[in-house]
């Protein structure tokens, strides 16, 4: 299964395109925008009514090796009095990102792109009430 | 680069780090997961800090479609369904990696690109209470 023609656009292949063996693609892992400025957050993970903690996962066979995952601290949401309100739900917000996976098969090495689902933070939602007939 | 443990019996010529350029299998692992957040959950409507999702499309990128969240309100929705301006709806941002066609228009040559996306919104208390 090859990457589909992105956005249903059929590209004219430029003469300058590098030769690529069948079934694979050339990937430069020098990241564009690697050094873009990201200011510190104002502790939204602690100030949220659906607060969360961060865990760093590390895998030496993955690029990037570090992926940060959020976990909601509570099942309910924090009310104005600072207490957990279980009539509301803290739920995770997730986003997909790409990583490069390095696989060892004997002494040979292959590379595979992988979609990873990252939990970015949490939000407070009204629960869906299912009425029993 | 990233140091990779390798089989001690393998030749020493192998680079321990990820090389700058790699040949990658065209099949993307887990690629069929649902990428449309509108279909995957209705949190964007049910949240006390609801958001709208805007489609960002770029044919020179994979994935070509990324959904950007924009908070609907400055404040948060209270128990009565009204906007409470003593609380703030704020976007949750995340840096993600995508593929950028390089050189442009080439079908099977890419470079990793880091982009910042707003994934959703959360309701926060202001750091200092509002002036009465």
């Amino acid at each position: 299964r090859k990457i589909p023609k992105v956005g249903h656009t059929f590209f004219q292949k430029p003469e300058s395109c590098p030769p690529v063996p069948g079934g694979s693609m050339k990937l430069d892992i020098g990241i564009i925008n690697e050094n873009q400025r990201v200011s510190m957050s104002r502790n939204i993970e602690s100030r949220s009514t659906s607060p969360w903690n961060y865990t760093v996962t590390w895998d030496p066979n993955r690029y990037p090796s570090e992926v940060v995952q959020a976990q909601c601290r509570n099942l309910g949401c924090i009310n104005a009095q600072g207490k957990e309100d279980i009539s509301m739900n803290s739920v995770p917000i997730q986003q997909e990102t790409l990583v490069v996976r390095r696989k060892h098969q004997g002494c040979s090495v292959s590379f595979q792109l992988e979609k990873v689902l990252v939990t970015v933070g949490c939000t407070c939602v009204t629960p869906v009430i299912h009425h029993v007939q | 680069g990233i140091t990779i443990p390798r089989n001690p019996g393998c030749p020493n010529s192998e680079d321990k780090n990820f090389p700058r350029t790699v040949m990658v299998n065209l099949n993307i692992h887990n690629r069929n997961t649902n990428t449309n957040p509108k279909r995957s959950s209705d949190y964007y409507n049910r949240s006390t800090s609801p958001w709208n999702l805007h489609r960002n499309e770029d044919p020179e990128r994979y994935p070509s479609v990324i959904w950007e969240a924009k908070c609907r309100h400055l404040g948060c929705i209270n128990a009565d369904g009204n906007v409470d301006y003593h609380m703030n709806s704020v976007p949750i941002q995340q840096e993600i990696l995508v593929l950028r066609r390089e050189p442009p228009h080439c079908p099977n040559s890419f470079r990793l690109e880091k982009i910042l996306v707003s994934v959703g919104c959360t309701c926060v208390t202001p750091i200092v209470h509002h002036v009465a």
């Epitope: 200011s39 510190m40 957050s41 104002r42 939204i44 | 908070c71 400055l74 703030n88 709806s89 704020v90 976007p91 941002q93 910042l116 707003s118 926060v124 202001p126 750091i127 200092v128 509002h130 002036v131």
Partner: nanobody, 127 residues
Framework: EVQLVESGGGLVQAGGSLRLSCAAS????????IGWFRQAPGKEREAVSC????????YYADSVKGRFTISSDNAKNTVYLQMNSLKPEDTAVYYC????????????????????WGKGTQVTVSS
């Protein structure tokens, strides 16, 4: 104690101009976002214009671009909103607010996550 006090509102005819002022005490604009918001009767509060002193980025709502200008006088700790070519739909209570919105990137317009709000000044534009 932090206080933001707006002034300069009033009644003006369509096509006219007003200049709103927001005097801040107990609060400096350095490394903060500051902005103007408005709320029309029965409508939601919305961002009009905000800027971040940390990098000079300015945001304007589409509905006021080319007509409104935000500026500040750091010596007086005051932020202004010059409103030209006013329209009846600009009628609202205008609020000044300040906070740490400068965490967010320019495309997110610095109007999120305000900590301090003034009490507002009424602007009425008659046709």
């Amino acid at each position: 104690e932090v206080q933001l006090v707006e002034s300069g509102g009033g009644l003006v005819q369509a096509g006219g101009s007003l200049r709103l002022s927001c005097a801040a005490s107990g609060f400096t604009f350095d490394d903060y976002a500051i902005g103007w918001f408005r709320q029309a009767p029965g409508k939601e509060r919305e961002a009009v214009s905000c800027f971040s002193s940390s990098d000079g980025s300015i945001y304007y709502a589409d509905s006021v671009k080319g007509r409104f200008t935000i500026s500040s006088d750091n010596a007086k700790n005051t932020v202004y909103l010059q409103m030209n070519s006013l329209k009846p739909e600009d009628t609202a209570v205008y609020y000044c607010a300040g906070g740490g919105g400068s965490y967010y990137y320019t495309q997110l317009n610095y109007c999120y996550d305000m900590d301090y709000w003034g009490k507002g000044t009424q602007v009425t534009v008659s046709s």
